[in-house]
Every structure is written in structure tokens, then in C-alpha cells.
Interface confidence: medium
């Protein structure tokens, strides 16, 4: 059994979140995850879910009694979602910590917008597109 | 030229974000995007970036002078990042709108944590794993 299971059960008790009434009005995350099978779509959704949990866990910092549970779960998220890749986790954290109300951050975001947009479509980065461009150039050159 | 380019240039003027000083202290998003080539890693990062822009645009919803630019860019993000898939965009928006300080949301999130964690690793959902399980079962049955 993964280490997070016991600690998540501990948090459930703490939150009184085992009660049947918790399930009222549908799920937060599970229903949405069910909708998406494609790996890249799942990553889009899971990215938001993981950042939600990180924010929630930040709110726990005043209570020592659940620190161990929180740390264990965070560590396990790190393994599962970021493949224990510290750089990936750090980049992710950086993105989640940018303040949308900070004037300098706003200006930078707008400054980078065109390039960010250009990279949004999967095609913008895949080797496939680059290869087809090369072939096209080659064909033109040999005409 | 994609429609967003002209509108992003318009926002740059509005934000005074064309100045060279904007680039001081490095980039927000571009440096991070450069680090990740794998499509699923890129989606993890882009998910945070897109939600940042949506939040930023929400902050400017009352300013009529840039409404057209903002709407055009959002629509183009919708095309590029969500493949014009309304359901995908709606699920994404739902996730970004959950309040981390809402008691009911907190309880639901903890209630769902074990199942969310179980789905975080790519292996947890891919057909590959399902197929290998089927093969394994078949082999056991035929022994």
C-alpha cells in the first residue's frame, strides 16, 4: 500500500471528511478526471488539481498534528506527478506562486503573451511539424 | 498572422509592456517552457500559465478599451489550448474556480484525495498497463 493512503485516511478523520454528506452535490475532481482519457488532457486537469492541493496544504501549516500526513502526501505527489524530478516540481511551484495582481508580473506576462500563445498548440513543438517543414523545403529545393 | 498577435500588441501598449526594462530579472513563462520538451510535461506547465492569463484577464473585465483584445486572445487560447472543445474548457474553468478556503470544498478535496492520488501516475490510466494486465491474466489462465 502506498504511504499516502494511511496519511490521507488520517486527514479524512481530521476533516470529518468520511461522512456520507461529503458526497452531496457531486464530486470536485473525480467526475472531471473521468471525462479525459488522453494523457495530455489529463495533465491539463491534474495540473490544476495538484496546485489546488498544494494551496490547501499550505493552509495547514499552523497545525503540527497533521504535518507528517501532509508532508508524506506531498512527497508522494512529487513522486507520482513529477516523477521525483525536482526541477519539474520547482518550475511548477514557480508558476503557481506568481501574483496576478503584481504590476511587474502583469507587464512581463503581457510582454511574453505572443510567444506563449505561439507555443500552445501541440503542433508548435512536435518533431512532426519540423520534419514536414524540412521535407517541404527539400521538395521545393529539388524542383 | 493569427488574430491574437495584433490584439496582444494592443495589450502591450496598454500595459506599457514593450519597454526593454520589462525583460529585467528574467522571464516568467518562456524560460520554464524551454525546459520541457515532452508534451505531457508541457501541458502541466501550460495549464498553470493559461489559468494565470485567465485570472489576469478577469481582473480587466471592466475596462472597455481592451475588451475586444482580451476576448480575441481568450478565444484564440480556446482554439489552441483546448482544441475548441467547450467541455474541456468548462472542466478547466471549474477546477480553477474552486475556492481553497471554502469548508465544503476542503472536505470534498480530502474525501477524494486517495482516488486522485491513485490516478496521478501516467501508468494508472494508460491502455498499455491494462493490456499488460490482460496478457498476464491470459497467461495465468492458460498455465
Amino acid at each position: 500500500q502506498d504511504p499516502y493512503v494511511k496519511e490521507a485516511e488520517n486527514l479524512k478523520k481530521y476533516f470529518n471528511a468520511g461522512h456520507s454528506d461529503v458526497a452531496d452535490n457531486g464530486t470536485l475532481f473525480l467526475g472531471i478526471l473521468k471525462n479525459w482519457k488522453e494523457e495530455s488532457d489529463r495533465k491539463i486537469m491534474q495540473s490544476q488539481i495538484v496546485s489546488f492541493y498544494f494551496k490547501l496544504f499550505k493552509n495547514f501549516k499552523d497545525d503540527q498534528s497533521i504535518q507528517k500526513s501532509v508532508e508524506t502526501i506531498k512527497e508522494d505527489m512529487n513522486v507520482k506527478f513529477f516523477n521525483s524530478n525536482k526541477k519539474k516540481r520547482d518550475d511548477f511551484e514557480k508558476l503557481t506562486n506568481y501574483s496576478v495582481t503584481d504590476l511587474n508580473v502583469q507587464r512581463k506576462a503581457i510582454h511574453e503573451l505572443i510567444q506563449v500563445m505561439a507555443e500552445l498548440s501541440p503542433a508548435a513543438k512536435t518533431g512532426k511539424r519540423k520534419r514536414s517543414q524540412m521535407l517541404f523545403r527539400g521538395r521545393r529545393a529539388s524542383q | 498572422q493569427d488574430p491574437y498577435v495584433k490584439e496582444a500588441e494592443n495589450l502591450k501598449k496598454y500595459f506599457n509592456a514593450g519597454h526593454s526594462d520589462v525583460a529585467d530579472n528574467g522571464t516568467l513563462f518562456l524560460g520554464i517552457l524551454k525546459n520541457w520538451k515532452e508534451e505531457s510535461d508541457r501541458k502541466i506547465m501550460q495549464s498553470q500559465i493559461v489559468s494565470f492569463y485567465f485570472k489576469l484577464f478577469k481582473n480587466f473585465k471592466d475596462d472597455q478599451s481592451i475588451q475586444k483584445s482580451v476576448e480575441t486572445i481568450k478565444e484564440d487560447m480556446n482554439v489552441k489550448f483546448f482544441n475548441s472543445n467547450k467541455k474541456k474548457r468548462d472542466d478547466f474553468e471549474k477546477l480553477t474556480n474552486y475556492s481553497v478556503t471554502d469548508l465544503n470544498v476542503q472536505r470534498k478535496a480530502i474525501h477524494e484525495l486517495i482516488q486522485v492520488m491513485a490516478e496521478l501516475s501516467p501508468a494508472a490510466k494508460t491502455g498499455k498497463r491494462k493490456r499488460s494486465q490482460m496478457l498476464f491474466r491470459g497467461r495465468r489462465a492458460s498455465q
Epitope: 481530521y14 490547501l56 495547514f60 499552523d62 503540527q64 | 475556492s99 471554502d102 476542503q106
Partner: nanobody, 113 residues
Framework: QVQLQESGGGLVQPGESLRLSCAAS????????GGWYRQAPGKQRELVAF???????RYIDSVKGRFTISRDNAKTTVYLQMNSLQPEDTAVYYC???????WGQGTQVTVSS
């Protein structure tokens, strides 16, 4: 949505006492773990006193021995008994649970001669 309501603040002289209370304005709400926070003008909000699930309590150094945090048996109300108040205790006091939910209005405590 649960709303927190703090009460019991006021204007007192140095050395006097106040007892703050906090409860949810509606809905069933339990302070399994919670705390009192304060925010003085121009300063960050800080955690002053904390009570955990197991009734352990923690205080910042400047209020140790003077402030006591407690809650009722049903855990629906949390209190802060403040003795020997000093001018530097002047602030808006807020209660919350851990993890935080949306903040209430707070209650003003002013210590002045």
C-alpha cells in the same frame, strides 16, 4: 458558505482584560483545530494562539502567560482570554480554523490609557 463572527473586542486600559469569542454565523461548524490571529495597522496578520485537535495549545512569545485559548466542548466556539493587555496588543483580532476558511470581519481591540 460558513461565516465566522468574532466578538468581545473593545477599548481598555493597559493591564485590563478582555475575552474574545468566535463562532460560525450559520451551519454546523467545528473548530477541530483553530486559532486567533491579529493584524495591527500596517502589519501582516499573525497567528497569536493556536489550539490543536488534541487540545495542545501554542502561543507567540509576546503573549505567553497572558493569553489563553480555549473552546467549548462541542468545539463550535473558540475563545481567547486576554489578561494584562498592553498597548502593543492593539489590533483587529480574527479567529479561523486550520486550514483557513474565509476570514470574518474581526473584532477591534484597542489598549490605550
Amino acid at each position: 458558505q460558513v461565516q465566522l463572527q468574532e466578538s468581545g473586542g473593545g477599548l481598555v486600559q493597559p493591564g485590563e482584560s478582555l475575552r474574545l469569542s468566535c463562532a460560525a454565523s450559520r451551519g454546523i461548524f467545528r473548530f477541530n483545530a483553530g486559532g486567533w490571529y491579529r493584524q495591527a495597522p500596517g502589519k501582516q496578520r499573525e497567528l497569536v494562539a493556536f489550539i490543536g485537535v488534541d487540545n495542545t495549545t501554542r502561543y507567540i512569545d509576546s503573549v505567553k502567560g497572558r493569553f489563553t485559548i480555549s473552546r467549548d466542548n462541542a468545539k463550535t466556539t473558540v475563545y481567547l482570554q486576554m489578561n494584562s493587555l498592553q498597548p502593543e496588543d492593539t489590533a483587529v483580532y480574527y479567529c479561523n480554523k486550520v486550514p483557513y476558511i474565509d476570514w470574518g470581519q474581526g473584532t477591534q481591540v484597542t489598549v490605550s490609557s
